[in-house]
Amino acid sequence: EPPTACREKQYLINSQCCSLCQPGQKLVSDCTEFTETECLPCGESEFLDTWNRETHCHQHKYCDPNLGLRVQQKGTSETDTICTCEEGWHCTSEACESCVLHRSCSPGFGVKQIATGVSDTICEPCPVGFFSNVSSAFEKCHPWTSCETKDLVVQQAGTNKTDVVCGPQDRLR
């Protein structure tokens, strides 16, 4: 009696259980009563990542440099290519199909967390006593200069965008 179900890594065809092709290989011809399943390795730039009965291998993903992408991990006959973003860019989605430039923190804001290949820069407003006078994807808020430690006095108050201006103390005659 012909089988209705097959073992793991087999498939049912023409009332017969045939072996699936291993990852990295595609199906050329089904097994018969007298012959084994015929499989062939995937070609260059192709892969299959499961035991399968596919007649065509999948093409490796292309990491398009025009979208800011580069190869992070080459694909093999059994795995797809993994793309990542060039330095200074990060992925727009989990699948990393394109990249955008890391955001810069404007003057008055500092970098709380530097961007990675998968996350953007996180900015924070400079609190009282700190400032940032540049637009940067790396610079944190800097503390105001302490005039006292230099034996100077504050001549101009600092803001979130500017440092304090120190000057000499008025000498009593």
Epitope: L69, R70, V71, K74, T76, S77, E86
Partner: antibody, heavy 119, light 109 residues
Framework: QSLAESGGRLVTPGGSLTLTCTVS????????MGWVRQGPGKGLEWIGT??????TDFATWAKGRFTIAKTSSTTVDLKMTSLTTEDTATYFC???????????????WGQGTLVTVSS | AFELTQTPASVEAGVGGTVTIKCQAS??????LAWYQQKPGQPPKLLMA???NLASGVPSRFKGSRSGTEFTLTISDLECADGATYYC???????????FGGGTEVVVK
């Protein structure tokens, strides 16, 4: 299509040198480029690769002392610092088969330029 | 660190003969192996990529194959012009190792 290296010369230990690869019939906006060196009577040694985006990757031993940059639409420079006698070699520039990857094979090579590090 | 071990370092054969050069990778590099030919005073010339794909203009006397992490370059019907040094190169990842094998000198008698 051709590549030509220039800038090789005698340099003293501790010195710096910049080599230039000038390409003809090759589009540096679509082709990745690499540098490979060969010591006298020795084998080939990969130095680094530059992708079309300008991103670079280097062999571990070359990181920090070597930089690669596209300096025009037809030139790629290899800058070398803190040179030692071990850096004496013929330096080749070569076109990579892929433009988005650090690790490539090279399908077109220049004739090479000789760098001698000696006191 | 990743290593490519090329054997033999030197091989001699007569015109019309066959030579076999092996390249052993210390870890899986899938099909990412290229072969080059280099003659004295000249730059290397690409012979083959993806373990077995002939570069354009390379005669079919050159054949590449792969078995796991072992790669083989076979040159049959040897000609005098085949006398050169042959290098394999992994382009899967550098992984701190030299991406080139040590080279094999082929002497044609």
């Amino acid at each position: 299509q051709s590549l030509a290296e220039s800038g090789g010369r005698l340099v003293t230990p501790g010195g710096s040198l910049t080599l230039t690869c000038t390409v003809s019939g090759i589009d540096l906006s679509t082709d990745g480029m690499g540098w490979v060196r060969q010591g006298p009577g020795k084998g080939l040694e990969w130095i680094g690769t530059i992708r079309v985006t300008g991103g670079t990757d280097f062999a571990t031993w070359a990181k920090g002392r070597f930089t690669i940059a596209k300096t025009s639409s037809t030139t790629v420079d290899l800058k070398m610092t803190s040179l030692t006698t071990e850096d004496t070699a013929t330096y080749f520039c070569a076109r990579g088969h892929a433009n988005n990857d650090a690790y490539v094979y090279f399908n077109l090579w220049g004739q090479g330029t000789l760098v001698t590090v000696s006191s | 660190a990743f290593e490519l071990t090329q054997t033999p370092a030197s091989v001699e054969a007569g015109v019309g003969g066959t030579v076999t050069i092996k390249c052993q990778a210390s870890q899986s590099i899938d099909r990412y192996l290229a072969w080059y030919q280099q003659k004295p005073g000249q730059p290397p010339k690409l012979l083959m990529a993806a373990a077995a794909n002939l570069a354009s203009g390379v005669p079919s006397r050159f054949k590449g194959s792969r078995s796991g992490t072992e790669f083989t370059l076979t040159i049959s019907d040897l000609e005098c012009a085949d006398g050169a040094t042959y290098y394999c190169q992994s382009y899967f990842t550098s992984d701190d190792g030299n991406t080139f094998g040590g080279g094999t000198e082929v002497v044609v008698k």
